[in-house]
């Protein structure tokens, strides 16, 4: 006789991260009766929220509930009604709502009110909406992509489908990059982590975990580039900024007020002689390099070493997966392959920074030019990021690997954000031989 | 000191649609969150909706019935419920409060309270 | 939505003496970016709107006196009087403000014995 598939027994989950630039609703599926297994729970759907991110909606928060309609109502659509009130919703707002508090918890609060009163409209479980920690993102972003590799489990379960997957249960680090914030989060060698303020300790599944994590506040990589044009135009002689992280014969006019509105540029804050300055491009990688590194104060430590602005770092250990921007830039940049190492990575953002403006837009026609124009600075950022405030060296570089998806479910905190929210990580190593994930009989 | 005045009280036929009124005065209004929150006589609480920097919400019970708005220039929020039935027969209460990004310290401000009465 | 639950529904006690009034929530209402639990307290005298005792869980709001305190955290909190006056008979409500939809407890009457 044909096997026939059981009702699905399945659990459904939304986690909506709340990012500087941009929203993004994740929705998780996992079977009711596995909950406890590691690896069972993936995602079903990413629903982009179009606009900004929302913490750029504070002159206008009566329409955040515009703005979150449509990715809402996707939602409706994908879980099947008889779930809707059982579904637990939460939303997570990063390093964009940390700088808005910064400056204003009132305008924070307004915002986050305006949030929870319209999620709270839908037919789902909302659970609320709050501003994430930066250890916090650190630590469920590593959970996340530790979970999808099946390393907190007894057997390495996708061993041969995750190509970068080793056979061995030691975890991944996590390198996390944003547009406000950076992560870096890993299982440190025998090595007392000296701060206390980055030392996470787990068990999970049975197994403790001393966790060194830390996100670094400003160096996302939009407000490193704000930080760049602060610090660079304190030296400009006029309203002209030759920039050598942009394109050549790219051109842009900034009003001084934007470069200022952030937290990350008041250190660089000075009266300037002029309301706008137009940046001109001149595209050289080795120039965007050197500039870049001054954001990094690298003259004071307190520790046996750091990273950079006297954050203690632990020696680097192990494999890492990068993911977020890190990705989406590598990618982008054609630069996420095992096999390029990091001279060639080098070589390659000589050659694209050094590359012609109106060249590059024809290059890529269907590339928004905003975005298309700081591919430039984020590559070499992130570059500069990773070997000079992270210590990765060309050898190292080879255990770093550019994740995008793992099984079919985005690498970023939210995953693991909403395991530890549901209690679906067990400290115990579940006593049951996990099931089999077919469904059928 | 922010002071609540609500509407007096209607008497209204089942079936029709009752708008209650709660002007602030001595404080930022557009700041402030408002709760709708009903007692029928003898009975307990019940929060009905709230409205906060232009956002109106609802609980699942009323959504549908009742209308939340609210008028910066005059300071004044607004509750209106319809298809009145007689259980809807209470005492309505504007508060100022809402949940946690809005109403950091509960509901400290109330209304007089309007009574409505649905009788055919 | 959160199910606030008070218990007893109604308390006689002698004046001068101790009243505890309980509320559990169905859910925590700890908030765990700053620690604070949103509960609030209400007393509401006949004829009157409600009054606000007690937010986050244990702070007295202002002219309170002192012999009212909130006491609890997650789920389980109590309210107490320490020394039960006249002017302390009516019904005192819970009620959670860490998520929408608000809800309140069904009640506790406050008598004198």
């Known amino acids: 006789t044909q096997n026939k598939a059981l009702p699905e027994n399945v659990k459904y989950g939304i986690v909506l991260d709340a990012g500087s630039s941009h929203t993004s609703l994740y929705i998780y599926k996992w079977p009711a009766e596995k909950e406890n297994d590691t690896g069972v729970v993936h995602q079903v759907e990413e629903c982009r929220v179009k606009g900004p991110g929302i913490s750029k909606f504070v002159q206008k928060v009566n329409e955040i509930g515009i703005y979150l309609t449509d990715c809402m109502e996707r939602a409706r659509e994908v879980i099947p009604r008889s779930q809707h009130q059982e579904t637990p919703v939460y939303l997570g707002a990063t390093a964009g709502m940390r700088l808005l508090r910064m400056e204003s918890e009132e305008l924070a609060d307004r915002v986050l009110d305006v949030v929870e009163r319209s999620l709270s409209n839908y037919p789902f479980d909302f659970q609320g909406a709050r501003i994430i920690t930066g250890q916090e993102e650190g630590a469920y972003g590593w959970i996340t992509i530790n979970y999808l590799l099946g390393k907190f489990s007894q057997k390495t379960r996708w061993f041969s489908i995750v190509p970068y997957e080793t056979n061995n249960q030691e975890t991944f680090g996590a390198l996390d990059l944003g547009g406000a914030s950076t992560q870096v989060t890993f299982v440190p060698q025998n090595q007392t982590i000296e701060s206390p303020d980055n030392a996470l300790q787990f068990r999970l599944y049975g197994k403790d975990y001393n966790v060194y994590t830390h996100s670094f506040l400003c160096y996302g990589k939009d407000q490193a580039l704000w930080q760049k044009l602060a610090k660079d135009i304190q030296v400009a002689s006029n309203e002209i900024l030759r920039d050598p992280c942009f394109h050549p014969g790219y051109k842009k006019v900034v009003n001084v007020s934007d470069l200022y509105k952030t937290p990350c540029t008041k250190r660089f804050e000075m009266t300037l002689p002029f309301q706008q300055f137009e940046i001109q491009g001149i595209g050289n990688y080795q120039q965007c390099h050197q500039s870049i590194l001054e954001l990094f104060n690298t003259s004071y430590c307190p520790y046996s070493q750091c990273a950079f602005n006297g954050i203690f770092l632990p020696p680097l250990q192990g494999d890492f997966g990068a993911f977020s921007a890190f990705y989406f830039v590598m990618k982008f940049l054609n630069l996420t392959s095992e096999k390029v190492s990091q001279e060639k990575v080098t070589e390659m953002m000589k050659k694209f920074c050094s590359k012609s403006w109106e060249e590059t837009k024809t290059s890529y026609p269907s590339v928004k030019e905003k975005y298309l124009s700081e591919y430039c600075f984020s590559g070499t950022y992130i570059l500069s990021l990773l070997l000079q405030g992270y210590h990765f060296t060309a050898d190292s570089w080879e255990h770093i690997h550019f994740i995008g998806k793992i099984q079919g479910s985005d690498a970023g905190w939210t995953l693991g954000y909403m395991l530890n929210l549901t209690n679906m990580i067990p400290a115990e190593q579940p006593l049951s031989t996990p099931l089999s994930h077919s469904t059928y009989v | 000191q922010v002071q609540l005045v609500q509407s007096g009280a209607e008497v209204k036929k089942p079936g029709s649609s009752v708008k209650v009124s709660c002007k602030a005065s001595?404080?930022?209004?557009?700041?402030?969150?408002i709760s709708w929150v009903r007692q029928a006589p003898g009975q307990g609480l019940e929060w009905m909706g709230g409205i906060g920097f232009g956002t109106a919400n609802y609980a699942q019970k009323f959504q549908g019935r009742v209308t939340i708005t609210a008028d910066e220039s005059t300071s004044t929020a607004y509750m209106e419920l319809s298809s009145l039935r007689s259980e809807d027969t209470a005492v309505y209460y504007c508060?100022?409060?809402?949940?946690?990004?809005?109403?950091?310290?509960?509901?400290?401000?109330w209304g007089q309270g309007t009574t409505v009465t649905v009788s055919s | 939505g959160i199910v606030m639950t008070q218990s007893p529904d109604s308390l006689a006690v002698s004046l001068g003496e101790r009243a505890t009034i309980n509320c559990k929530s169905s859910q925590s209402v700890l908030f765990s970016s700053n620690n604070k639990n949103y509960l609030a307290w209400y007393q509401q005298k006949p004829g009157q709107p409600p009054k606000l005792l007690i937010y986050w869980a244990s702070t007295r709001a202002s002219g309170v006196p002192d012999r009212f305190s909130g006491s609890g955290s997650g789920t389980d909190f109590t309210l107490t009087i320490s020394s039960l006056q006249a002017e302390d008979v009516a019904v005192y409500y819970c009620q959670q403000y860490y998520l929408y939809p608000l809800t309140f407890g069904g009640g506790t009457k406050v008598e004198i014995k």
């Open positions: 508060a100022r409060g809402g949940a946690k990004y809005a109403g950091r310290y509960g509901m400290d401000v």
């Open positions: 001595g404080g930022t209004f557009s700041s402030l969150p």
